[in-house]
Each structure stands twice: as structure tokens, then as C-alpha cells.
């Protein structure tokens, strides 16, 4: 069967300053790809975290993402500002030259209150 | 105070249509998700349709998908559903009902409104 | 699409007795679990929801467990009031979502 992209939240809020988690979990690790969260939609998405190698100030992995059973891909936002605030997704995506995206969560959006 | 009243229920011959409306009161019902829940005589409940706040989002259960539309009108704060081929099976008691702001549970309930489908 | 399974179908005590109701999924849900009462002639009303949290007004004799896939309503004293229908909810996957069968707490 498909591989599923589950969002629990539909959305969250945080206060300035603080951190919060968004939730993802997947039904399957296959097909053999990366998982990647973004913030919006299309073209002008932004990437907000990738479970590669790749650093991301702020943002870090909840759960150990190396550990071959792991199917929870949630991150952690820390020291959240208001420029922070929109609609995350966590996208799974096939490897491949280029990667090609297969599944979305529902997207969880992230309201920030002022302190 | 929370006020969801379901109305449009009766009597339809099978085949036949009726539009259910659900008016909503006591909270900014265009920032919520709502549902239609039904529950045949005697049965369990069956979760049937969603519609996000601003109307994007739109789910079906596999039983009435393409039988029937959700819609909503936050001008009016009402909730619709437009029954088309109605089926015996169709029978059941209607509940609109919110879901909570963050997760896709039930905070509250209409009354209900009654649909029975028979020739 | 994530089946739930309620057990049992009826279940018959006395007031001032304790009532144990089971809810398995067919996968893990996590603790993304509701329970809600259904009276005869009334719409359901939410008593638990993250598998273990009382919604607001709901009496402390009423609490949730579990995670994962097996969840339990407990009913420590039952009242007169308590004899209903129990259903239990998952909204851990996008829609659909889906109800358990209920379980009905009939009077001995």
C-alpha cells in the first residue's frame, strides 16, 4: 500500500520566544527517499528541514530519523518569532535524479503569540 | 454557548434528493471545521463529510462520495449537505457537529435531524 | 482506513459498580483517541480526548487510558445517569475518520 503522511495537528500555537513540535509520522519508510518539511505551498515553499546531513538553525529532528524502524519525522521549531508563523508540511520523497515528491501531510498550522 | 440545529430531514422516496442545513451559533464559525456524522436506527455513528473553515478542504466517506455535497455559507453561519441517488441504506439520523480548533475530534453536537429514505 | 474495535458489545452492572470499556485500532493511533456518551434520543457528548484528558465538565469518575492501540474508558462508580452507549474515535489519521462499534452499559 501507499505510503501515508500523517499530521495529527491540525495547528498549533506558540509564544514568541518558545519552541514548539510539529508532528509527522509515516506509515512505511518505502519507497527509499528523503522526508523534507516545508513551510507553504508551490513554488514559493520554503525549506524548513531536511533529515539529511544538512544543519538547520532552530529546527532539529525530535526522534532519531537514523534508526532504521523510525517512522517519526517530527521536528522541533526553538526560539520561534512571528516570522515563523504559516502552514508547515512534511513531504515524502522518492530518491531519484532529481527527488520526486509522493506524499504530503495535511499541514499544520503554526499561530505565534506575542509574549 | 455552542448552538448547532439541524433541520431539512424527512421523508424522500429512494433516488430522490434533500438538502440538509445546520445553523450555527455561539462561536466564529468560519474558523472552524465541521462535520456531518450519521447514525442509522439502532446502529452506530458513521462519520460522513468535512468542510474546512474557509471552505477548501472538502472530504468524503467513500459511501456518499459523489452522491453528495458538503457546502457552507459563513455569511449565514450555516452548514449544508446536499443529498442526490438517495438509498434505503441512506437512512439514518444526521448530526452536524465542530471539531475541536486543533484536532479532528468533536467538541459539539447538533441534535440531529432525521432521514429516512423508503418508497 | 484505521478500524476500531470496541469490546464488549454490552456490558451489564449495577449503580456503584466500576465499568472497564475496551477500544483496540487496527494501528497504532498513538493517543490521538476520543470517547464520547450517547444517550437514547441524544446527539453524543464528548468525555475524553487525547486518550486520557476529561473534557471540560466531564466528572472525574470518568478517565482514559492507553496509547498505541489498545485504550480503556473507566467508569469508577457508575451513576443512573452513566447508562449509555460509549463510542470511541480516532483522529490520528486524515479523514476518514472512524468511530468503534460502541459498547452500551446496560443496568443489572
Known amino acids: 500500500t501507499e505510503v501515508k503522511v500523517i499530521q495529527p495537528e491540525k495547528s498549533v500555537s506558540v509564544a514568541a520566544g518558545d519552541s514548539t513540535v510539529l508532528n509527522c509520522t509515516l506509515t512505511s519508510l518505502l519507497p527509499v527517499g528523503p522526508i523534507r518539511w516545508y513551510r507553504g505551498v508551490g513554488q514559493s515553499r520554503q525549506l524548513i528541514y531536511s533529515f539529511t546531513t544538512e544543519h538547520f538553525p532552530r529546527v532539529t529532528n525530535v526522534s532519531d530519523a537514523t534508526k532504521r524502524s523510525n517512522l517519526d519525522f517530527s521536528i522541533r521549531i526553538s526560539n520561534v518569532t512571528p516570522e515563523d508563523a504559516g502552514t508547515y508540511y512534511c513531504v515524502k520523497f522518492q530518491r531519484g535524479s532529481p527527488d520526486t515528491e509522493i506524499q504530503s501531510g495535511g499541514g499544520t498550522e503554526v499561530y505565534v503569540l506575542a509574549k | 454557548e455552542v448552538q448547532l440545529v439541524e433541520s431539512g430531514g424527512g421523508v424522500v422516496q429512494p433516488g430522490r434528493s434533500l438538502r440538509l442545513s445546520c445553523a450555527a451559533s455561539?462561536?466564529?464559525?468560519?474558523?472552524?471545521?465541521v462535520n456531518w456524522v450519521r447514525q442509522a436506527p439502532g446502529k452506530g455513528l458513521e462519520w460522513v463529510s468535512l468542510?474546512?473553515?474557509?471552505?477548501?478542504?472538502?472530504y468524503y466517506a467513500d459511501s456518499v462520495k459523489g452522491r453528495f455535497t458538503i457546502s457552507r455559507d459563513n455569511s449565514k453561519n450555516t452548514l449544508y449537505l446536499q443529498m442526490n441517488s438517495l438509498r434505503a441504506e441512506d437512512t439514518a439520523v444526521y448530526y452536524c457537529?465542530?471539531?475541536?480548533?486543533?484536532?479532528?475530534?468533536?467538541?459539539?453536537w447538533g441534535q440531529g435531524t432525521l432521514v429516512t429514505v423508503s418508497s | 482506513e484505521i478500524v476500531l474495535t470496541q469490546s464488549p458489545g454490552t456490558l451489564s452492572l449495577s449503580p456503584g459498580e466500576r465499568a472497564t470499556l475496551s477500544c483496540r485500532a487496527s494501528?497504532?493511533?498513538?493517543?490521538?483517541l476520543a470517547w464520547y456518551q450517547q444517550k437514547p434520543g441524544q446527539a453524543p457528548r464528548l468525555l475524553i480526548y487525547?486518550?486520557?484528558s476529561r473534557a471540560t465538565g466531564i466528572p472525574d469518575r470518568f478517565s482514559g487510558s492507553g496509547s498505541g492501540t489498545e485504550f480503556t474508558l473507566t467508569i469508577s462508580s457508575l451513576q443512573s445517569e452513566d447508562f449509555a452507549v460509549y463510542y470511541c474515535?480516532?483522529?490520528?489519521?486524515?479523514?476518514?475518520?472512524?468511530f468503534g462499534g460502541g459498547t452500551k452499559v446496560e443496568i443489572k
Open positions: 468542510i474546512s473553515g474557509s471552505g477548501e478542504i472538502i
Open positions: 457537529a465542530k471539531e475541536n480548533n486543533r484536532y479532528r475530534f468533536f467538541d459539539d
Open positions: 455561539g462561536f466564529t464559525f468560519s474558523s472552524y471545521d
Open positions: 487525547g486518550a486520557s
Open positions: 494501528q497504532s493511533v498513538y493517543t490521538y
Open positions: 474515535q480516532q483522529y490520528y489519521d486524515r479523514p476518514p475518520l472512524t
